[in-house]
Interface confidence: low
């Protein structure tokens, strides 16, 4: 005697989030009479997905008309798939009765949802660092499925190799997250540099997602200081110049000290940018030589970006 078979031809089906999934099921016999039901999972905790007999299943549509007596196609279409729909679906034939009795189950079809990773978010260090130091950048992306994913780091188009990546969770899940930390050695020329985190995933059709961070947010380029004296003017005044060069960011306070006493304090603002993104600033101080008996010790004191002050001193000779 030919036995009823419930055939689920596909062992697995992969669908992109937002699309519809078709789960195929064929019953090889019209007898015994009884409904077909679809479940996700097995055992007492299984979830009813669709029943010919009863219930309201707004996202599930039978592919063929189940009211047709000779219908043996019990395939269903689930619309607007989300990662939460992932799992193994079973097509189950029941014999009509009070209550209906489970007769036969198909082998199951595993539905995997291809969910795109979220746009990678790159975050840099909390505090700035200077050239030659290594800083860490973290890239995070969430909500993707399947688990296989490729992450690369670039600095100005050049691939980086010093990074560590984790995909969580380690076991099976409806969706996954990736977190990667790259170590980047800063150079003085990095004000205009960018780090890019590039995530490639089957859902992206070869068009990877990128997250960027500007190294300008992470770098501090300390200034060079040079104090020079211009020639004495006819009115016995000497012009002393403090050149502060190649610094970044712009936040800088300059204080002139005459023999240890504060003479003037200035704040840098609206400076033009150098080619490499750094800034230069020049401050002048006029010293009235005739008002002094002894040599005048001038100090240019620069406090850059909240760092300890850097001094450069210069002695203005007062001839007897």
């Amino acid at each position: 005697e030919e036995e009823l078979q419930v055939i689920q031809p596909e062992k697995s089906v992969s669908v992109a989030a937002g699309e519809s999934a078709t789960l195929n099921c064929t019953a090889t016999s019209l007898i015994p009479v009884g409904p077909i039901q679809w479940f996700r999972g097995v055992g007492p905790g299984r979830e009813l997905i669709y029943s010919q007999k009863e219930g309201h299943f707004p996202r599930v549509t039978p592919v063929s008309d189940p009211t047709k007596r000779n219908n043996m196609d019990f395939s269903i279409r689930i619309s607007n798939i989300t990662p939460a729909d992932a799992g193994t679906y079973y097509c189950v034939k029941f014999r009509k009765g009070s209550p209906d009795v489970e007769l036969k189950s198909g082998a199951g079809t595993e539905l995997s949802v291809r969910a795109k990773p979220s746009a990678p978010v790159v975050s840099g260090p909390a505090v700035r660092a200077t050239a030659e130091h290594t800083v860490s950048f973290t890239c995070e992306s969430h909500g993707f499925s399947p688990r296989d994913i490729t992450l690369k780091w670039f600095k100005n188009g050049n691939e980086l190799s010093d990074f560590q990546t984790n995909v969580d969770p380690a076991g099976k899940s409806v969706s996954y997250s990736i977190r990667s930390t790259a170590r980047v050695v800063l150079t003085r020329r990095d004000v205009h540099s960018q780090v890019i985190c590039e995530v490639a995933h089957v859902t992206l059709q070869g068009d990877p997602l990128r997250g960027t961070a500007n190294l300008s947010e992470a770098i501090r380029v300390p200034p060079f200081l040079e104090v020079t004296q211009q020639s004495m003017r006819a009115d016995n005044q000497v012009n002393v110049t403090c050149q502060v060069t190649k610094f970044y960011p712009q936040r800088l306070q300059l204080t002139w000290l005459e023999n240890g006493n504060v003479s003037r304090t200035e704040m840098a603002s609206a400076l033009p940018e150098n080619k490499d993104g750094t800034y230069n600033w020049t401050s002048w101080l006029l010293v009235n030589v005739s008002a002094h008996r002894d040599d005048v010790k001038l100090t240019c004191q620069v406090e850059h970006d909240g760092q300890p002050a850097v001094n450069k001193s210069f002695s203005v000779k007062v001839s007897a």
């Epitope: 600095k155 100005n156 188009g157 050049n158 205009h192 540099s193 960018q194 890019i196 960027t212 500007n214 033009p272 940018e273 150098n274 080619k275 020049t282």
Partner: antibody
Framework: QVQLQESGPGLVKPSQTLSLTCTVS??????????WEWIRQHPGKGLEWIGY???????YYNPSLKSRVTISVDTSKNQFSLKLSSVTAADTAVYYC?????????????WGQGTLVTVSS | DIQLTQSPSSLSASVGDRVTITCQAS??????LNWYQQKPGKAPKLLIY???NLETGVPSRFSGSGSGTDFTFTISSLQPEDIATYYC?????????FGGGTKVEIK
Amino acid sequence: QVQLQESGPGLVKPSQTLSLTCTVSGGSISSGEYYWEWIRQHPGKGLEWIGYIYSSGFTYYNPSLKSRVTISVDTSKNQFSLKLSSVTAADTAVYYCAREGLDGSYGSSAWGQGTLVTVSS
Amino acid sequence: DIQLTQSPSSLSASVGDRVTITCQASQDISNYLNWYQQKPGKAPKLLIYDASNLETGVPSRFSGSGSGTDFTFTISSLQPEDIATYYCQQFAYLPYTFGGGTKVEIK
């Protein structure tokens, strides 16, 4: 030896967007060695620097044009592009693309031959 | 923006003459200055970079000097093929700017 070639329409109507592409051959645009820039020259006049792009995507635009300019790069095609929106007759010029070195020679040592764009209805 | 004032705006000299063009910056630009030659209908050509360095392949009769705000471009012995407009360009500050140009003609 690197060569640059501008391409795009020679006539643009006022208020429309001027779009030009510069194709680079004989060198990789994704090399971190250069800035890729656009410069224009109004008829019979001097040169005006428009802006540049770095392989990382970093851009800098001349503030006088900033609100209207977009420079982008397509490393897969070895091209970079200029878009200038809301054009007027004052944007009629020869537009040059050029390559500027980051190390060694800082000058724009390689230029396209230039393309004349006329803004007229 | 940095202003570059080139002078003269045009000059006429004889073959073999020494020709000098000056470029004055509105503020200190160190040696971040280039000199270009542009012949009619052609793209500019880099001659001098960093104020005084001769670009590869450029004849030695061309030279540049200066630093800070005052720069000089010299053709030691003018040749017929030197008929062109010459531009200085600063790259010390963004945006880059060019001088107004000097048109060199032969008497």
